[in-house]
Every structure is written in structure tokens, then in C-alpha cells.
């Protein structure tokens, strides 16, 4: 495998991770695929310090993160444990609200204008943040 030692152009390094902040909007699944195409994942927030860093860069704009409950329980896209991990939900969130009239509930988490988290309809075209870890060997698949 190959090891990434510095961040790609236009990515921001912070605490041994690289972050890319979109300036356009996509549905959650499309944002997830964009990050995967870039060998990254939607941002996984593991501490108050990381929360403040991301919040500083995105400003007061709804922005997707790598947290969803589309298959039942809440899960981080990189496998980080949700139950024991950092959380920063708005009061009374997540609420899986069905009253939006778009069908179904709310299965994807985003940063709100004050940085705290809300669950929302995954199809909404919000901005997003990709994250990839430095010094993590990328397991390049063997050639067939």
C-alpha cells in the first residue's frame, strides 16, 4: 500500500487529517460517493476540538457529515462507534421528523447554522465535508 504524508492541493490539514470543504450542494449519497472517489469519507467528528475546526470552516451553512441511520441505528461512515463517541445534536434532535411531506423520515445528519447537528431528509442538496487521514496506508488492491 501507499502512505499519504501530506494533504492534496485544496485540502486543509488539521490534526493529522485532511479536509475538503465543498462550495456546492449534493444529496447525502452523492456527497458520500464524491468523497469515496477522492479516497476519503464524509467527515467523522470525534471530538469537540474537531467540531470547532469544521464549524469554523463551513460557517453558518447546512453541511452534511458522515453520520446516518438509513439502516436502523446511527452509524459513522468509517465505523467509528456512535454510542460511545462524540455527539453535538441540537436539543430534541435527532427526531426522524415525517412532517416535511417528502416521504419517509430523516436519516442523514448535518451541521446546522449554529454548528449543532440535526437529522434531515437525505435528498436535500447541502454542502459537505470530506475527510481522509494522514499516515493511513491506503490498501491498494492487487491487480487481477
Amino acid at each position: 500500500g501507499s502512505e499519504r504524508t501530506c494533504c492534496p492541493v485544496n485540502w486543509v490539514e488539521h490534526e493529522r487529517s485532511c479536509y475538503w470543504f465543498s462550495r456546492s450542494g449534493k444529496a447525502w449519497a452523492d456527497a458520500d460517493n464524491y468523497c469515496r472517489l477522492e479516497d476519503a469519507h464524509l467527515v467523522v467528528v470525534t471530538s469537540w476540538e474537531e467540531q470547532k475546526f469544521v464549524q469554523h470552516h463551513i460557517g453558518p451553512v447546512n453541511t452534511w457529515m458522515g453520520l446516518h441511520d438509513q439502516n436502523g441505528p446511527w452509524k459513522w461512515v468509517d465505523g467509528t462507534d456512535y454510542e460511545t463517541g462524540f455527539k453535538n445534536w441540537r436539543p430534541e434532535q435527532p427526531d426522524d421528523w415525517y412532517g416535511h411531506g417528502l416521504g419517509g423520515g430523516e436519516d442523514c445528519a448535518h451541521f446546522t447554522d449554529d454548528g449543532r447537528w440535526n437529522d434531515d431528509v437525505c435528498q436535500r442538496p447541502y454542502r459537505w465535508v470530506c475527510e481522509t487521514e494522514l499516515d493511513k496506508a491506503s490498501q491498494e488492491p492487487p491487480l487481477l
Epitope: K26, D30, N33, E38, D39, P125, S138, P141
Partner: antibody, heavy 117, light 108 residues
């Protein structure tokens, strides 16, 4: 200068296999996602497959899923497309393309694949 | 999947004419749209990215506009080398990346 050079096309019978290659130069190959796009004779452009810079994450069009495999060798700056169970409708010019910010910015000149008995 | 509907499928024009090609997306794609030119027997070349940004080295007679679901490519004064086929491409929602059907610009 970005250069992409495809090879490996040719005539193959239905059900047969072929492996296309795309040799890249002029940019840091491992840092960029890459893709294959095809064009049937006299028809429009159709996206086929894409891979992230490391090759870990791959994407396929429904029409080729389970039959085609995209891969890359970053030590050789080369992209591959392994095509199995080929059908007449796979006949096309196959282009490799570099991706930046999710969109194709540079293309090779293409290699023709003809599937016929 | 997002469908891209391009019109017209072909058009005849003269050198010096102003022409417009339209691409409509089946759902909103923001400005995640590119325009490509393809000449017979050649690979496509990117003219426009992000709906309205001109690719480096592309003449300024080419311009793109639009956002959401409706986009246009305009050639302000058609030149002999502009007779080709033009494709739009959306990259807001992938996979799949989807192209318009193409517009063939022919000499009148």
C-alpha cells in the same frame, strides 16, 4: 502536458474477454481518480467505470456491472479495464479520462473494441 | 439516475452565426455541468466546466450559462473549426455520470 494513451482494443467474439490499458503521463497519476467512457459507432458518450486514486473505491455503470473490472497500477501509471462476457452491444471506442473535482478534464484518443462472431 | 436532455440534436449554421445549445437535467444539479466538443475520429475536449467557467485555452466565443436544471452553451460567432458535435455532462449525482445525447453542428 497531460497525456493518456489507450491500448488493447481489437476484435473479440461474443462471450470473450479483453483487457484495455491506459498509460498516463504529465501528472501525478496516483493523486487522481480515473475513468473509462465509451462511444458506440455513430452514437453518443456513455460512462462505463471509475476508480479513486488508490484503486480502493470503484464505480460501474449498470450495463457492465459484474462483467467489467477497473483497476490501476500506480507504480506503472497505468489504468486497466478487464472486460469479460463481452456482448455485441459493448462494441465501441473506449476512452480513458482523468477526473478532477468529479468531472472529466482530459481524455485519451481511444481504442476500438469490436465484439462480433 | 439523472437524465440529460440536449437540444437540438443537430443544427445547420453559417460561419459568423451565433448559436445556442440547451441541456436540461431531470432534477436540479446546481452548476455541476460541463460542455465538451468532439470532432470526427477524435476524443472529446472540455470547453466549459462548472456550467460557466471557460477551460484554459478555449476561445472566448464559447460561453456557458445556467444552473439547476437548464443550461446553455453559446458560440457567439461560429468559426470553421467549430463544426463538431457538442455534449453536456452532469457530475452532480454519480454514479452514473450522464451525458446529453449530443448536438451536431453542421455547415449550412
Amino acid at each position: 502536458e497531460v497525456q493518456l494513451l489507450e491500448s488493447g482494443g481489437g476484435l473479440v467474439q461474443p462471450g470473450g474477454s479483453l483487457r484495455l490499458s491506459c498509460a498516463a503521463s504529465g501528472f501525478t497519476f496516483r493523486s487522481y481518480a480515473m475513468s473509462w467512457v465509451r462511444q458506440a459507432p455513430g452514437k453518443g458518450l456513455e460512462w462505463v467505470s471509475a476508480t479513486s486514486g488508490s484503486g480502493v473505491n470503484t464505480f460501474y455503470a449498470d450495463s457492465v456491472k459484474g462483467r467489467f473490472t477497473i483497476s490501476r497500477d500506480n507504480s506503472k501509471n497505468t489504468l486497466y479495464l478487464q472486460m469479460n462476457s463481452l456482448r455485441a452491444e459493448d462494441t465501441a471506442v473506449y476512452y480513458c479520462a482523468k477526473l478532477e473535482l468529479g468531472i472529466f478534464d482530459y481524455w485519451g484518443q481511444g481504442t476500438l473494441v469490436t465484439v462480433s462472431s | 439516475d439523472i437524465q440529460m436532455t440536449q437540444s437540438p440534436s443537430s443544427l445547420s449554421a453559417s460561419v459568423g452565426d451565433r448559436i445556442t445549445i440547451t441541456c436540461r437535467a431531470s432534477q436540479g444539479i446546481g452548476n455541476d455541468l460541463g460542455w465538451y466538443q468532439q470532432k470526427p475520429g477524435k476524443a472529446p475536449e472540455r470547453l466549459i466546466y462548472a456550467a460557466s467557467s471557460l477551460q484554459s485555452g478555449v476561445p472566448s466565443r464559447f460561453s456557458g450559462s445556467g444552473s439547476g436544471t437548464e443550461f446553455t452553451l453559446t458560440i457567439s460567432s461560429l468559426q470553421p473549426e467549430d463544426f463538431a458535435t457538442y455534449y453536456c455532462l452532469q457530475h452532480n449525482s454519480f454514479p452514473p455520470w450522464t451525458f446529453g445525447q449530443g448536438t451536431k453542428v453542421e455547415i449550412k
